[in-house]
Interface confidence: medium
C-alpha cells in the first residue's frame, strides 16, 4: 500500500541535495586554507541530522546547533555586508572587495546557498516532491530555520562599521519581514557595532532621487538608532559604475559621484 | 595572471554543431561555477549558461534551452551547441562566479577579466 505522503506548497529538495552539499564543502575547504580541518563527512552527517526524520514545520534552530558547531567560523568582524533583496550584487561586490564578506563567503552559507531540502517526519527520505512554503505551509521549516540561525550568528559576529545593500528598485527598500530586516538589524550588538551604512542601490539610469530619504530607510534608521547603533546611508545611483570603480579605483571617472 | 581561454568556435551552417571549450591559467577553474556568455553585434552581452562548482546543477537562458548543453570535467567547462541558428551568431566568452551555485545568468560586471572569447559565425 503506497504510503501517503504530505503535499507542500513549496518547491521539493534540490536534487541530488547530499551529493551538493558534500562537494560544495570539499571545494570551500580547498579554496579556504583556515578551513582545511573541516571534515565534509561529519558536516553532511550534521546537516542531515537537522531535518531528517522530522516533521518539517516543527524544525528548530536547536536542531541546527551540531552544523553550527562544525561550521564555526572567523570572519573579520569589521567587513560584513549584509544584503536585502539583491544578493547578485552583494557577491559580485564582494568578488571584487575580496576583504569583505557576505553570508554566502562563509562555509554554511556556501554550502546551502540557492539549495531547498525537508525531509518528512519518521522516516529517513528527503522528500523531493514538496517543501514547506514559508508563508502557505509555516515558518519553522528546515530552510528558514537554518538561514534564520546562520543570519543570526553572523550579525551578532559583526563590529565597526557594518554595512548593507538594499535594493532601490523596491517598493519596500528596507522590509521589517525581510531576513535583514526580521534577524540581522535585531542582532548587532550595539556594544560592539559602531554604525550600520545602507548603501541603497537605484535601478533606473536616470533615478536621481535620494532614496535615503525613503520612509522605509527612515523607519531603519528609527530601529538601529533606538538601538543606539548609528545610522548612515548612501545612494549608489550607478551600480555598474559603483562596481568597476571598487575593481579599479584609480580611474579618473572615479571621483564623482557613483 | 588569471587568464580564461576560450576555443572551439567557427563558422557554421543554421542547423549545425559546435563544442566550444573554456581553460584557465593561473586559477583553478574548478574551484568555482562557470557562466558562457555571448555579445552578438550591436547587442549587451548575454548570459546563456552556468554550470555550478559540483557539475550537477546547470542553468540556461531561454534563448538556448534545449540546443545548447554546459558541462564539465577537471580541466574545462565545455558548451556542446546544437542546432544553431543565425540569431546565435556572437563572440563568445567563459567566465568564473565566486559563488558554488549559478542561480542567475546576468552578466556579472565583477570577473576578474574576461578573456578574448571566440567567434561563432552561423551561416549559409
Known amino acids: 500500500v503506497p504510503r501517503w505522503r504530505q503535499q507542500w506548497s513549496g518547491p521539493g529538495t534540490t536534487k541530488r541535495f547530499p551529493e551538493t552539499v558534500l562537494a560544495r564543502c570539499v571545494k570551500y575547504t580547498e579554496i579556504h586554507p583556515e578551513m582545511r580541518h573541516v571534515d565534509c563527512q561529519s558536516v553532511w552527517d550534521a546537516f542531515k541530522g537537522a531535518f531528517i526524520s522530522k516533521h518539517p514545520c516543527n524544525i528548530t534552530e536547536e536542531d541546527y546547533q551540531p552544523l553550527m558547531k562544525l561550521g564555526t567560523q572567523t570572519v573579520p568582524c569589521n567587513k560584513i555586508l549584509l544584503w536585502s533583496r539583491i544578493k547578485d550584487l552583494a557577491h559580485q561586490f564582494t568578488q571584487v572587495q575580496r576583504d569583505m564578506f557576505t553570508l554566502e563567503d562563509t562555509l554554511l552559507g556556501y554550502l546551502a546557498d540557492d539549495l531547498t531540502w525537508c525531509g518528512e517526519f519518521n522516516t529517513s527520505k528527503i522528500n523531493y516532491q514538496s517543501c514547506p512554503d514559508w508563508r502557505k505551509d509555516c515558518s519553522n521549516n528546515p530552510v528558514s530555520v537554518f538561514w534564520k540561525t546562520v543570519s543570526r550568528r553572523f550579525a551578532e559576529a559583526a563590529c565597526d562599521v557594518v554595512h548593507v545593500m538594499l535594493n532601490g528598485s523596491r517598493s519596500k527598500i528596507f522590509d521589517k519581514n525581510s531576513t535583514f530586516g526580521s534577524v540581522e538589524v535585531h542582532n548587532l550588538q550595539p556594544e560592539k557595532v559602531q554604525t550600520l551604512e545602507a548603501w541603497v542601490i537605484h535601478g533606473g539610469r536616470e533615478d536621481s532621487r535620494d532614496l535615503c530619504q525613503d520612509p522605509t530607510i527612515k523607519e531603519l534608521e528609527s530601529i538601529i538608532s533606538k538601538r543606539n547603533i548609528q545610522f548612515s546611508c548612501k545612494n549608489i545611483y550607478r551600480p555598474d559604475k559603483f562596481l568597476q570603480c571598487v575593481k579599479n579605483p584609480e580611474d579618473s571617472s572615479c571621483t564623482s559621484e557613483i | 595572471q588569471v587568464q580564461l581561454v576560450e576555443s572551439g568556435g567557427g563558422e557554421v551552417q543554421p542547423g549545425g554543431s559546435l563544442r566550444l571549450s573554456c581553460t584557465a591559467s593561473?586559477?583553478?577553474?574548478?574551484?568555482?561555477?562557470i557562466g558562457w556568455f555571448r555579445r552578438a553585434p550591436g547587442k549587451e552581452r548575454e548570459g546563456i549558461a552556468c554550470?555550478?562548482?559540483?557539475?550537477?546543477h546547470t542553468n540556461y537562458g531561454d534563448s538556448v534551452m534545449g540546443r545548447f548543453t554546459i558541462s564539465r570535467d577537471d580541466r574545462a567547462v565545455y558548451l556542446q551547441m546544437n542546432n544553431l541558428e543565425a540569431g546565435d551568431t556572437a563572440i563568445y566568452y567563459c567566465?568564473?562566479?565566486?559563488?558554488?551555485?549559478?542561480?542567475?545568468?546576468?552578466?556579472?560586471?565583477?570577473?576578474?577579466?574576461w578573456g578574448q572569447g571566440t567567434q561563432v559565425t552561423v551561416s549559409s
Open positions: 567566465a568564473p562566479a565566486r559563488f558554488s551555485a549559478c542561480s542567475a545568468l546576468d552578466v556579472k560586471l565583477s570577473f576578474t577579466s
Open positions: 593561473g586559477f583553478r577553474l574548478d574551484y568555482y561555477a
Open positions: 554550470i555550478d562548482i559540483t557539475g550537477i
